[in-house]
Interface confidence: low
């Protein structure tokens, strides 16, 4: 069945209740350098007035605090109303290293990143953080980097292993989640001259994704304990038609060309699915298309094989899919699928539908392909246009945590954490905000607030108070590795 | 129990036209879909095509295109096959079946037949 | 369109001994893992009944002694042990690409 009822039941205590920004840009400078300059001025207000130094006086200075950063104020004032106990974000590559390799590192980019996550954990928000968060409209990478091919040349993936060194060198003792890559499955979007085009890339990006995480492996993890993944699109497709042959196989093939794609190779086989690979050859022996996936070494399927810590997806629809067998050598029409708009269902300003119960199918279909593992979903919300009382945010979120929470109590899916998408909206994009662009709270924040302080849908009677130990823990180790690092 | 009921035997004249009927009972009707099975006199079984009674949508045998239309009503829980411009080589008994669809699954198989309807094509 | 020819045409078995009819595709009938093979039994005046479905899946309620094995484009139904009520003409049915087509039938006579 599509929907079943409502369930009412409670996520386990160490569940992770979040939300989830993109990329932040570091504030170059802290905001309120007056504590940080010793000497004294007298304003000639009469005058000319400008500030004239007293020679030979020093006063006493304060050191430099993250709060000097309007940004970050910012950024905790609101996650302080959001209660969430995480928080997701994106650091910007070519900020931190914008040569592309160590030659050149940004301080004090690494600084206000470190001030995001330590003062984060003062309020007891613990950081999921992203290293490379590619957008349709901005590739994200340093300079020399996307002047010398971007991620169609192999040695980007090397350059991204020297810049996750850094980054859990800098940030390591203070983060214990890490997403190398937020949905590397969507790059097809940029990368999509052709169809070897995108695969090549996708290549490189698995190949990145694996350096980094048997970097963090061998060298950081015996002293941080921390966990890395990478995050993938995970939209749930069903057929069209549900009587047509031809439309399940095409749901199926989207999953696998979509997700199975990325997770194949790192959670289970070292290679890609040998379902895509065979329907990409099959096309290519019938004269419709000349991709063909990447063949890979033995060595390379050795890198690539069982390089994650845990399950990270990100989802917000589900897709209504038919076959149509297109010609063309791109990484769409190697696919021949053909998505339909349900016009009779709920949707978004962006037309997004709201289909709470593919979530849960999508859950269980990780699980069947890849294994019972610790899952998080990762993002996952829509575009809600009403500026306060944003009611389809609200709907969307009680339903779709509705359908986590059964996958959770009743299929017994391993699901450690929800992370809504997202904190605040960027002006003239879509409104997936819990805040305005101008940071004007939306009703939504209240409901997901609920959520979180009951641990799900309790029964009536039911506590939703977690043992001292259990709610207190990681902030008393977070507490005191920022007293320990400044 | 699950039946699906045809109607009785037809002869007609060549070039004409005739209608046969589907009747579904013990099960929801719009919840699968019903091909048609044609059988010529001591030969083998060819698949004409199905329509997905929820829709109305149908998919041919190419080899049927023309010569078939498949329709139902819903209201009555009948599938209806129309057969063209009939010749001797459609002297055939004619079989409804149900297939049944299992969440994930896209294997093709017919679990419950009809009766099957003779049809005799003669001047 | 994928054509499955079936052999024997047909043959007789001893009461208790074990019938096998093959079912060869003009190509592949697999699918990521999968068998896309059917069988069924008819009787004469009877409309066909399923026995096997996915190559080697009993549909409930047929008996144990019905079994089918193969995978691409070799087929075989086996009967064993072989009863008076197994008399009737058996077909394969390929589901993995349209046209469904069948086999041309193999009919089995009990001696």
């Known amino acids: 069945k599509e929907s079943t009822p409502d369930v009412q039941g409670q996520f386990p205590c160490d569940f992770s209740w979040g939300v989830t920004e993109s990329v932040l840009k570091p504030e170059s400078v802290a905001s309120s350098p007056q504590f940080s300059d010793p000497h004294l001025y007298v304003w000639n207000a009469t005058g000319n007035r400008l500030l004239h130094r007293v020679e030979g006086v020093r006063l006493k200075t304060r050191p430099a605090q993250c709060t000097d950063f309007v940004n970050i104020k910012k950024q905790l004032e609101m996650l302080a109303r959001m209660k969430v106990t995480h928080y997701r974000f994106a650091l910007d590559w070519a900020s931190v290293l914008p040569t592309g390799n160590l030659s050149a590192v940004n301080r004090q980019a690494l600084r206000y990143y470190r001030c995001v996550v330590s003062e984060g954990l003062k309020l007891g928000i613990s950081a999921m953080v992203t290293l490379y968060y590619p957008t349709h409209a901005h590739l994200g990478l340093p300079e020399p980097l996307l002047h010398a091919d971007g991620w169609l040349n192999p040695s980007t993936a090397e350059a991204f292993q020297a810049y996750a060194g850094l980054c859990f060198q800098e940030l390591g003792d203070l983060v214990k989640l890490w997403i190398t890559i937020n949905e590397p499955n969507r790059l097809s979007d940029i990368y999509n001259r052709s169809g070897n085009d995108t695969y090549g890339a996708a290549h490189n990006l698995l190949v990145a994704h694996a350096l980094a995480w048997r970097l963090y492996d061998r060298q950081f993890r015996p002293s941080q304990r921390g966990a890395v993944s990478l995050s993938l699109h995970a939209d749930w497709a069903e057929p069209a038609n549900p009587y047509a042959d031809s439309h399940w196989r095409a749901a199926e093939r989207f999953l696998q060309f979509e997700i199975a794609w990325f997770a194949e190779p790192l959670f289970k086989t070292g290679d890609y699915p040998a379902a895509m690979r065979e329907y990409i050859a099959s096309k290519h022996r019938r004269g419709l298309s000349s991709s063909a996936l990447p063949r890979l070494t033995e060595a390379e399927r050795r890198l690539l094989k069982g390089t994650v810590d845990f399950c990270a997806l990100n989802h917000f629809t589900t897709r209504f899919v038919m076959h149509e067998q297109l010609a063309g050598s791109r990484y769409d029409s190697d696919r021949d699928i053909q998505f339909l708009q349900d016009i009779t269902r709920l949707s978004s300003p962006t037309r997004l539908a709201v289909i709470p119960w593919g979530v849960r199918k999508l859950l269980r279909w990780v699980r069947r392909n890849y294994g019972d593992m610790d899952i998080y979903i990762t993002a996952s919300g829509i575009d809600d246009q009403a500026l306060e009382d944003d009611r389809l945010r609200k709907y969307y979120l009680g339903k779709y945590l509705q359908e986590v929470l059964k996958a959770y109590l009743i299929d017994k899916v391993r699901i450690k954490g929800y992370y809504a998408f997202k904190l605040a909206e960027e002006k003239s994009k879509p409104r997936f905000g819990f805040f305005t662009s101008d940071f004007k709270a939306k009703s939504s924040i209240q409901f997901y607030n609920k959520v979180i302080s009951s641990r799900g849908f309790p029964f009536e009677n039911s506590s939703s108070r977690c043992s001292q130990t259990q709610e207190n823990t990681e902030c008393t180790v977070c507490l005191f590795l920022v007293q320990k690092k400044p | 129990q699950v039946q699906l009921q045809q109607s009785g035997p037809e002869l007609v004249k060549p070039g004409a036209s005739v209608k046969l009927s589907c009747k579904a009972s013990g099960y929801t009707f719009t919840n699968y879909d019903i091909n048609w099975v044609r059988q010529r006199p001591g030969q083998g079984l060819e698949w004409i095509g199905w329509?997905?009674?929820?829709?109305?949508?149908?998919k041919y045998n190419a080899k049927f295109k023309g010569k078939a239309t498949l329709t139902v009503d819903t209201s009555s829980s009948t599938a209806y096959m129309e057969l063209h411009s009939l010749t001797s080589e459609d002297s055939a008994v004619y079989f409804c079946a149900r297939r049944p669809l299992y969440y994930g699954s896209t294997h093709w198989y017919f679990d419950v037949w009809g009766t099957g309807t003779t049809v005799t094509v003669s001047s | 369109d994928i054509v499955l020819t079936q052999s024997p045409a047909s043959l007789a078995v001893s009461l208790g001994q074990r019938a096998t009819i093959s079912c060869k595709a003009s190509q592949s009938v697999d699918y990521d893992g999968d068998s896309y093979m059917n069988w069924y039994q008819q009787k004469p005046g009877q409309p066909p009944k399923l026995l096997i479905y996915?190559?080697?899946n009993l549909k409930s309620g047929i008996p144990a002694r019905f079994s089918g094995s193969g995978s691409g484009t070799d087929f075989t139904l086996n009967i064993h042990p072989v009863e008076e009520e197994d008399a009737a003409t058996y077909y394969c049915?390929?589901?993995?690409?349209?046209?469904?087509?069948f086999g041309g039938g193999t009919r089995l006579e009990i001696k």
């Open positions: 049915q390929q589901s993995n690409e349209d046209p469904r087509t």
């Open positions: 996915a190559a080697s």
């Open positions: 329509i997905y009674p929820r829709d109305g949508s149908a």
